[in-house]
Interface confidence: low
């Protein structure tokens, strides 16, 4: 994992102010596979190259993301740069031999966040709870939440309960607890991302 | 403990070139950026230019284009800022700055581990 | 680039007081900004980002709100340790840019 984020980024990178104009524009109109979202057109065109490698990939995970990147390059007539892309992607990342289709991620599906692709792992493997209540409490924790999650007896149904209020969070509460994550257990979210 | 550790401070004569040093410790260098900002005396702060130390990217203020030059060396975990053809408008302190970068897209383009900061005075 | 117009340079204040540091934005910046305190001789630190987040370990004396184009970071409380210049900044698009600084004073 992140070999075709760089990738992505190398090529975005390169585009000239007005060729990355072009491409989130193009990004726009461009088909879809079944089941995929596309980026709001407000927060689209604002972004620099790492804003948008980051959005393409929470919105289509790498190997798509890195599909539909080279995609839209090939549409803008960047044939060349969108083959280094796709030689990228493809090096050494295990990928798929041609013909055959690589399996979906079944941990990632488009859109989620890291803490909603990783729920799982995160209610068996977090220890530092109480840690994380603090860094959430009074920003996206209520007193009540903050003491329902504290008088649950394990971590993992601490975590199981904490998570039983992520579906009214937007991506900042939920950056949130990413972030209290990094800095409490960042070995775990390294491995995470790894996976 | 996160922390930025930053190079001595540097003497140098007007046209010549300082490479400055920023060693991170307490955290996996590749998961977050390195922003570099210029703070002159009794003056405000000034965004130079960033690099992801995973892929060696790199973006700039326009303004520091061509006077600034942003490298990074995984092995040591450390960022690195080369000033050339110095005149006594760099004379500055230039702090090196963590940013977080995340998997949302959002704007995580906040610092929020600041370096111990690296004072460059040029005079002749 | 855009502006980031901090209104006031100085601001006097007493211990226990509650103060509010205002900061405005020439265009829409999404709500993506960030306030930094810094001491004399030492360097800048993360207090609120995205508006209104709390960085870890801030204390919750230190609040920031947004209203369009319009950010405001207080202290509800000020103590002495508060004495220092406080930054707003927008990390919503590049250059990222900074005000000018409020210098906050102990009457």
């Known amino acids: 994992m992140g070999r075709a984020r760089d990738a992505i980024l190398d090529a975005l990178e390169n585009l000239t102010a007005e060729e990355l104009k072009k491409f989130k524009l193009k990004l726009l109109s461009v088909p879809l596979r079944e089941g995929y979202g596309r980026i709001p057109r407000g927060a689209l065109l604002s972004m620099d190259a790492l804003d948008l490698t980051d959005k393409l990939v929470s919105f289509y995970l790498e190997t798509y993301g890195a599909e539909l990147t080279a995609n839209v390059l090939r549409d803008m007539g960047l044939q060349e740069m969108a083959g280094q892309l796709q030689a990228a992607t493809h090096q050494g990342s295990g990928a798929a031999p041609a013909g055959i289709q690589a399996p979906p991620q079944s941990a990632a599906k488009p859109g989620l966040h890291f803490i909603d692709q990783h729920r799982a792992a995160l209610i068996a493997r977090v220890t530092n709870v109480e840690w994380l209540l603090d860094a959430l409490y009074g920003k996206v924790l209520t007193d009540e939440q903050y003491q329902a999650v504290r008088a649950e007896p394990t971590n993992p149904s601490k975590m199981r309960k904490l998570f039983s209020f992520t579906p009214a969070w937007n991506w900042t509460c939920k950056d949130l607890l990413l972030q209290a994550l990094r800095e409490s257990q960042s070995y775990l979210v390294e491995d995470l991302e790894r996976s | 403990q996160v922390q930025l550790q930053q190079s001595e401070p540097e003497l140098a004569r007007p046209g010549a070139s300082v490479k400055l040093s920023c060693t991170a410790s307490?955290?996996?260098?590749?998961?977050?950026?390195v922003s570099w900002v210029r703070q002159r005396t009794g003056q405000g702060l000034e965004w130079i230019g960033r690099i992801y130390p995973r892929s060696g990217n790199t973006r700039f203020n326009e303004k520091f284009q061509g006077k600034a030059t942003l490298t990074a060396d995984t092995s040591s975990s450390t960022a690195y800022m080369e000033l050339r053809s110095l005149t006594s408008e760099d004379s500055a302190v230039y702090f090196c700055t963590r940013f977080p970068y995340a998997f949302s897209g959002n704007s995580y383009w906040y610092f929020d581990v600041w370096g111990t900061g690296t004072t460059v005075t040029v005079s002749s | 680039d855009i502006v980031m117009t901090q209104s006031h340079k100085f601001m006097s204040t007493s211990i226990g007081d509650r103060v509010s540091i205002t900061c405005k934005a020439s265009q829409d910046v999404s709500a993506a900004v960030a306030w930094y305190q810094q001491k004399p001789g030492q360097s800048p630190k993360l207090l609120i980002y995205?508006?209104?987040f709390r960085y870890t370990g801030v204390p919750d004396r230190f609040t920031g709100s947004a209203s369009g184009t319009d950010f405001t970071f207080t202290i509800t409380t000020v103590q002495a340790e508060d004495l220092a210049v406080y930054y707003c900044?927008?990390?919503?698009?590049?250059?990222?840019?900074f005000g000018g600084g409020t210098k906050l004073e102990i009457k």
């Open positions: 900044q927008q990390h919503f698009d590049t250059p990222y840019t």
């Open positions: 995205s508006s209104s």
């Open positions: 307490g955290y996996t260098f590749i998961n977050y950026g």
